[in-house]
Interface confidence: medium
């Protein structure tokens, strides 16, 4: 892949269920907008949801809420479908990348059939491809999973901005 992460974070949820990803950030990013996006191609990533201040935002089945006091923001994906599986970015709205995954972290979302038991193992995305001179990652996620017994009849799409 094109991300120099030794352990990209993976999170899994059941079809029809929901999952939440908590993305942490440094205090210098407290006042900036936070976003969640799905990169359609390398170096390009259209935002699905983005915070505006501390108010929560929703776009279809995806919501985002910033918690500046905790230096984290939470993205929740609801009524999961198999099409929701794939790579996403957790990011901070700044012009800068000090490293390609800062302040953006790659999150791999997996969706499994409802009723299947699987463990979601949150991994800290702090690796780099070479020996770091300074820990470059300033955003890191953790995950919680919420199971839902039945799939939603109207799953819809996770993102509206498709290029």
């Amino acid at each position: 892949g094109y991300f120099p992460l030794s352990h990209p974070m993976t999170v899994a949820g059941p079809v029809g269920g929901s999952l939440s990803v908590q993305c942490r950030y440094e205090k210098e990013h407290r006042t900036l907008n936070k976003f969640w996006c799905r990169p359609p191609q390398i170096l390009r990533c259209d935002k699905i949801v983005e915070t505006k201040g501390s108010a929560g935002k929703r776009n279809g089945r995806v919501s985002i809420r910033d918690s500046p006091a905790n230096l984290s923001f939470t993205v929740t994906l609801e009524n999961l479908t198999e099409e929701d599986a794939g790579t996403y970015w957790c990011g901070v709205d700044t012009p800068w990348l000090r490293d390609f995954h800062d302040p953006i972290v790659e999150v791999e979302v997996s969706v499994f059939p409802a009723g299947t038991t699987t463990a979601s193992s949150p991994q800290s995305s702090m690796g780099t491809s070479g020996p770091p001179t300074k820990l470059p990652v300033h955003t890191w996620p953790s995950v919680t999973r919420k199971d839902s017994p039945e799939p939603s009849p109207h799953p819809g799409s996770l993102f509206s901005n498709v290029r």
Epitope: F35, R44, D46, D93, L97, R98, G130
Partner: antibody, heavy 116, light 110 residues
Framework: EVQLLESGGGLVQPGGSLRLSCAAS????????MHWVRQAPGKGLEWVSA????????YYADSVKGRFTISRDNSKNTLYLQMNSLRAKDTAVYYC?????????WGQGTLVTVSS | QSVLTQPPSASGTPGQRVTISCTGT?????????VSWYQQLPGTAPKLLIY???QRPSGVPDRFSGSKSGTSASLAISGLRSEDEADYYC??????????FGGGTKLTVL
């Protein structure tokens, strides 16, 4: 096709003002940080300014701080650079570029000439 | 703000391997993993060749490769072709919310 198109360049006297525009198409403009980079005739590239996707964060090179203002109108898919108190050394081709600290899409540039 | 140091010129014959260096400081190149390289053909806008030290965007031939060690980065071009004749610039983020470019290297294919 992802495209950036600059306009607004021209001849201006020292001390004068000019506003450059950069029209974006082919991508969701509000999702991306934008930059202005300039290149004096026969010289190298110089980063000028940057703005975050939402427009909430702006940054400037020391050489233009206090004189230039970067802004964007996401409803019009347009990036701007307001240049005041222009000096002869500001003469350059000005490029707009898109990306998070690296520029993977560039416009063709617009020439600004500051001369009396 | 200063510029990253690049040799003003480099040259090679078709088929050769050429390397262009880019030297910064511990505040920019040495501290961050986002050295980018740009190619500027005569009369055109720059084009991204390498990002994040050694990653190639799609469409860039694998003849172009990047590396970084300490406060220096390098761009290597193998199997040199006449169409590679251009100016090459390195770039790095700095800790003071700014981008630095190198002075540029004019590559001549003999």
């Amino acid at each position: 096709e992802v495209q950036l198109l600059e306009s607004g360049g021209g001849l201006v006297q020292p001390g004068g003002s000019l506003r450059l525009s950069c029209a974006a198409s082919g991508f969701t403009f509000s999702s991306y940080a934008m930059h202005w980079v300039r290149q004096a005739p026969g010289k190298g590239l110089e980063w000028v300014s940057a703005i975050s996707g939402s427009g909430g964060s702006t940054y400037y090179a020391d050489s233009v701080k206090g004189r230039f203002t970067i802004s964007r109108d996401n409803s019009k898919n347009t990036l701007y650079l307001q240049m005041n108190s222009l000096r002869a050394k500001d003469t350059a081709v000005y490029y707009c570029a898109s990306g998070y600290g690296l520029m993977d899409v560039w416009g063709q540039g617009t020439l600004v000439t500051v001369s009396s | 703000q200063s510029v990253l140091t690049q040799p003003p010129s480099a040259s090679g014959t078709p088929g050769q391997r050429v390397t262009i260096s880019c030297t910064g400081t511990s505040s920019d190149v040495g501290n961050y993993n986002l050295v980018s390289w740009y190619q500027q053909l005569p009369g055109t806008a720059p084009k991204l060749l390498i990002y994040s030290n050694n990653q190639r965007p799609s469409g860039v031939p694998d003849r172009f490769s990047g590396s970084k060690s300490g406060t220096s980065a390098s761009l290597a071009i193998s199997g040199l072709r006449s169409e590679d004749e251009a100016d090459y610039y390195c770039s790095s983020y700095t800790g003071s919310n700014a981008l630095l470019f190198g002075g540029g290297t004019k590559l001549t294919v003999l």
